[in-house]
């Protein structure tokens, strides 16, 4: 499946490519910053190893039209170059970012800008992608992924963190957005809806897809996530839409078949290593790219978003398993975990193809 290109050549001229807004100095959200009633809020999970202490008992989720989520900020990891393999290696380190970002939730107080002022920034994510307004940029070359093929051992941690299902990735997964734009993958997680309701974060011409995968990467220019937060290009996320298809997706089944084991919020299991790239579309050459933010507090800006034009197909049963298995805080189902689309505010989305 490919996303529709309504027109061949109609790039939107001018505007900002989304320069970084210093944290705490963004404009407050305007009327259009508020999500539409039909757009429940969501999250962008930071790579982390464990929940912050004392944050297990979170209030019950009450659906409202605001964009807040009922979730906890996970620890920011220390990410270093691959070291001596005799030491246990993962991408995580207990490093609390700040108490005021520890408590936030779906559909209720506190408002996200109070949790993190960056959430009121002008260059936020997700956004609605309008292909006919995307600017073709010939400099956007095919993405390069290296080391995404993992043997079954050592196993990987799959966790229900209360607001998504997250797979922590080992060192050595390298991704290049282009020459000199090199990143290391930290974790991947998913966003989804509910029975009969789509749950992707990004939309295309207002169309919301059933689900969306995010693979979160840290620039090789930074050793730690907290150093990269808010810095232009410090973090990069590869995003792909998940759609319903006729056949079971064997790559996703390796994860979806384990969701029952982590139905409870905060639970985790170990899964055999797999081909991480098989969770993404096969066409690395056609994508949309823009500068935005994390889609949950701290909503740090400067994040490079790459949204594949090609979608990934899962069976109806698999999509149902994804949206109907996990539980979040307060005895609520973990569903509709997406943030409303945010205004572009002059940003131009670039396309790697005409």
């Amino acid at each position: 499946q490919r996303l529709p290109r309504m027109q061949e050549d109609s790039p939107l001229g001018g505007g900002s490519s989304g320069e970084d807004d210093p944290l705490g100095e963004e404009d407050l959200p305007s009327e259009e910053d508020s999500p539409r009633e039909e757009d429940p809020p969501g999250e962008e999970d930071l790579p982390g190893e464990e929940d912050l202490p004392g944050e297990e008992d979170l209030p019950e989720v009450k659906p409202k039209s605001e964009e807040e989520g009922s979730l906890k900020l996970e620890d920011l990891p220390t990410v270093e170059a691959p070291g001596d393999p005799q030491e246990p290696q993962n991408n995580a380190h207990r490093d609390k970012e700040g108490d005021d970002q520890s408590h936030w939730r779906y559909g209720g107080d506190p408002p996200w800008p109070r949790v993190s002022p960056a959430c009121a920034g002008r260059f936020q994510s997700p956004v609605d992608i309008r292909p006919q307004l995307a600017a073709f940029c010939p400099a956007l070359r095919p993405l390069e992924l290296l080391g995404f093929q993992l043997p079954p051992l050592p196993e990987l941690r799959l966790r229900n963190n209360g607001h998504s299902v997250q797979l922590t990735l080992p060192p050595g997964l390298e991704m290049a957005l282009g020459p000199g734009r090199e990143y290391r993958a930290l974790q991947l997680h998913l966003h989804w809806g509910a029975a009969g309701r789509p749950g992707s974060e990004h939309t295309v011409e207002g169309h919301r897809f059933p689900a969306e995968i995010h693979v979160v990467h840290l620039s090789t220019a930074f050793a730690r996530v907290d150093e990269a937060l808010g810095r232009p290009g410090g973090l990069a996320v590869l995003a792909a839409f998940l759609e319903e298809g006729p056949e079971e997706n064997s790559a996703y089944e390796q994860l979806l078949s384990r969701l029952e084991e982590i139905a409870e919020e905060g639970s985790e299991t170990q899964v055999p290593g797999l081909d991480i790239s098989a969770l993404l579309p096969s066409d690395f050459s056609r994508y949309f790219q823009y500068e935005g933010s994390l889609t949950t507090p701290p909503c740090a800006q400067g994040v490079i978003w790459t949204v594949f034009n090609q979608t990934v197909m899962l069976s109806a049963k698999q999509l149902h398993t994804l949206s109907d298995t996990l539980w979040g805080p307060g005895d609520s189902r973990l569903q509709l975990n997406f943030r409303a689309t945010q205004p572009l505010n002059g940003r131009v989305i670039e396309a790697s193809f005409p």
Epitope: P88, Q89, N90, G172
Partner: antibody, heavy 119, light 111 residues
Framework: QVQLVQSGGGVVQPGGSLRLSCAAS????????MSWVRQAPGKGLEWVSA????????YYADSVKGRFTISRDNSKNTLYLQMNSLRAEDTAVYYC????????????WGQGTMVTVSS | QSVLTQPPSVSGAPGQRVTISCTGS?????????VHWYQHLPGTAPKLLIY???NRPSGVPDRFSGSKSGTSASLAITGLQAEDETDYFC???????????FGGGTKVTVL
């Protein structure tokens, strides 16, 4: 000191059984997948079997499937290889090895123990 | 017959540079799986020399380096020394066999 100390090798007749042990110390054994690797006389290294950190998943080379069983006792920091229906071609030095936390490399090895299958 | 193919032997004079090749297929090295290298003195435990294609564990001299391209990998030893005379094995994972696989080994001789 990080080390794997092996025991249990010896001479056994074809069709017989033997149990190898590998005691770990100096690292968090229960956090690591483990493997057995062997080297027949004059031959190269051959992976035999592997087990996940929690013992829930096991893997075997086709040459030993159905005859060998890998297991572990994390409370004792010990890895085992139960070898049944032994054949002459199983004669080798057997090494236990830590699967490491880096993408399948074997980074800590035991000293090896000789298994001879002969009538 | 090993899944990964290495030359049985290579040799070089002290101080020289030697390389050992390791050729696989589309189900192991070519599939994107990492290649690791081990130094093995017969009668002792193998020692991890290179992991993840090109990374050296602490304590391994920088005379040893690894690289990978396509369906093959190579180990280079620069400034060859007498103590480098031993066996070297490459290793990867094979998705078709669902097994960790080794090369047949290469004997390095210092002339």
């Amino acid at each position: 000191q990080v080390q794997l100390v092996q025991s249990g090798g010896g001479v056994v007749q074809p069709g017989g059984s033997l149990r190898l042990s590998c005691a770990a110390s100096g690292f968090p054994f229960s956090s690591y997948a483990m493997s057995w690797v062997r080297q027949a006389p004059g031959k190269g290294l051959e992976w035999v079997s592997a087990i996940s950190a929690n013992g829930g998943t096991t893997y075997y080379a086709d040459s030993v499937k159905g005859r060998f069983t890998i297991s572990r006792d994390n409370s004792k920091n010990t890895l085992y290889l139960q070898m049944n229906s032994l054949r002459a071609e199983d004669t080798a030095v057997y090494y236990c090895a830590n699967n490491g936390n880096y993408r399948g490399a074997f980074d800590i090895w035991g000293q090896g123990t000789m298994v001879t299958v002969s009538s | 017959q090993s899944v990964l193919t290495q030359p049985p032997s290579v040799s070089g004079a002290p101080g020289q540079r030697v390389t050992i090749s390791c050729t696989g297929s589309s189900s192991n090295i070519g599939a994107g799986y990492d290649v690791h290298w081990y130094q093995h003195l017969p009668g002792t435990a193998p020692k991890l020399l290179i992991y993840g294609n090109s990374n050296r564990p602490s304590g391994v001299p920088d005379r040893f380096s690894g690289s990978k391209s396509g369906t093959s990998a190579s180990l280079a030893i620069t400034g060859l020394q007498a103590e480098d005379e031993t066996d070297y094995f490459c290793q990867s994972y094979d998705s078709s066999l669902s097994a960790w696989v080794f090369g047949g080994g290469t004997k390095v001789t210092v002339l």
